[in-house]
């Protein structure tokens, strides 16, 4: 069971300081951006991180959403990352959900975050280069200290 608590506005970056944004095709991508670019591309660069209480505490349970014309929420259904047009729900009556991730700081690096899927244990949000695009994907952690699954989360206010 997950119950919504509060929401924050955040900018999410990978460890190469590329900014996560949702493109016109609703794809989550990373791109080099100055602070000015980041502001100019808002609200596509501003993510609503909603925190949830968890009946089985396993870290901070969160959803990641973005509001352009409508609110879309990040999902890892079938291990494929996509944004689905939906509000983060108040309650989820299950111990796993495709839209719930456990946000945890990297041991020894309090400012670096990882997001583990609640549906697929051991699978994390990651940045992966595909041709000339840097995509947000779901990836099984295969090596300790994998930088591709680490992010910084900066609160908007």
């Amino acid at each position: 069971y997950f119950g919504k608590l509060e929401s924050k506005l955040s900018v999410i970056r990978n460890l190469n300081d590329q900014v996560l944004f949702i493109d016109q095709g609703n794809r989550p991508l990373f791109e080099d951006m100055t602070d000015s670019d980041c502001r100019d591309n808002a609200p596509r660069t501003i993510f609503i991180i909603s925190m949830y209480k968890d009946s089985q505490p396993r870290g901070m349970a969160v959803t990641i959403s973005v509001k352009c014309e409508k609110i879309s929420t990040l999902s890892c259904e079938n291990k494929i990352i996509s944004f689905k047009e939906m509000n983060p729900p108040d309650n989820i009556k299950d111990t796993k959900s495709d839209i719930i991730f456990f946000q945890r700081s990297v041991p020894g690096h309090d400012n670096k975050m990882q997001f583990e899927s609640s549906s697929y244990e051991g699978y994390f949000l990651a940045c992966e280069k595909e041709r000339d695009l840097f995509k947000l994907i779901l990836k099984k952690e295969d090596e300790l200290g994998d930088r591709s699954i680490m992010f910084t989360v900066q609160n908007e206010d």
Partner: antibody, heavy 118, light 107 residues
Framework: QVQLQQPGSELVRPGASVKLSCKAS????????MHWVKQRPGQGLEWIGN????????NYDEKFKNKATLTVDTSSSTAYMLLSSLTSEDSAVYYC???????????WGQGTTLTVSS | SIVMTQTPKFLLVSAGDRVTITCKAS??????VAWFQQKPGQSPKLLIY???NRYAGVPDRFTGSGFGTDFTFTISTVQAEDLAVYFC?????????FGGGTKLEIK
């Protein structure tokens, strides 16, 4: 910086129509919902409706569906509200206001004072 | 549409007092509630969004809390410049709605 510029006042005759304007600057006009809010003297705030300039999708409060029509001109980054069949009940301050990233309305115009009088 | 019932309508307080305003939604609005301050002759200003987040530049004496149907806005230590009308607002669903307002007057 973000600015929403509205004319200070409009005086119109009962039964006529008026088109109020709101010129936006300092941000990507097509990326945020624009809202219109009515405030009668000494009264509270009433939400009229909103428009998403990127797609021109609109929502209205039922009370204002036959009174207000929201439009935009993306080339000039201007939002408009047409108010029709005006009566003294329509005399009020009308604000345009922009959505924050997810919650609230963080930028407001100075408001246009509409006076309906013969 | 969702009705936001705001109480009290008026508050007469002294500088330094603690003030609490409540808003009750007619159905759950999650945490999609904002609070605004409107000073005489001015446009409203956003103070709190997502029920509890202080907007940039807002002094920390202003706080908000609540979830679902019951929301609270508090000014921990009222100052003379806080003379204004305060409104709650739900942006959970369309049509968006405002509370009736609370007029804060300083003795």
């Amino acid at each position: 910086q973000v600015q929403l510029q509205q004319p200070g006042s409009e005086l119109v005759r009962p039964g006529a129509s008026v088109k109020l304007s709101c010129k936006a600057s300092g941000y990507t006009f097509t990326s945020y919902w624009m809202h219109w809010v009515k405030q009668r003297p000494g009264q509270g705030l009433e939400w009229i409706g909103n428009i998403y300039p990127g797609t021109v999708n609109t929502n209205y409060d039922e009370k204002f569906k036959n009174k207000a029509t929201l439009t935009v001109d993306t080339s000039s980054s201007t939002a408009y509200m047409l108010l029709s069949s005006l009566t003294s009940e329509d005399s009020a301050v009308y604000y345009c206001t922009r959505d924050y990233y997810g919650g609230g309305l963080n930028y407001w115009g100075q408001g246009t004072t509409l006076t309906v009088s013969s | 549409s969702i009705v936001m019932t705001q109480t009290p309508k008026f508050l007469l307080v002294s500088a330094g007092d603690r003030v609490t305003i409540t808003c009750k939604a007619s159905q759950s609005v999650s945490n999609d509630v904002a609070w605004f301050q409107q000073k005489p002759g001015q446009s409203p200003k956003l103070l709190i969004y997502y029920a509890s987040n202080r907007y940039a530049g807002v002094p920390d004496r202003f706080t908000g809390s609540g979830f679902g149907t019951d929301f609270t806005f508090t000014i921990s230590t009222v100052q003379a410049e806080d003379l204004a009308v305060y409104f709650c607002h739900q942006d959970y669903s369309s049509p968006r709605t405002f509370g009736g307002g609370t007029k804060l007057e300083i003795k």
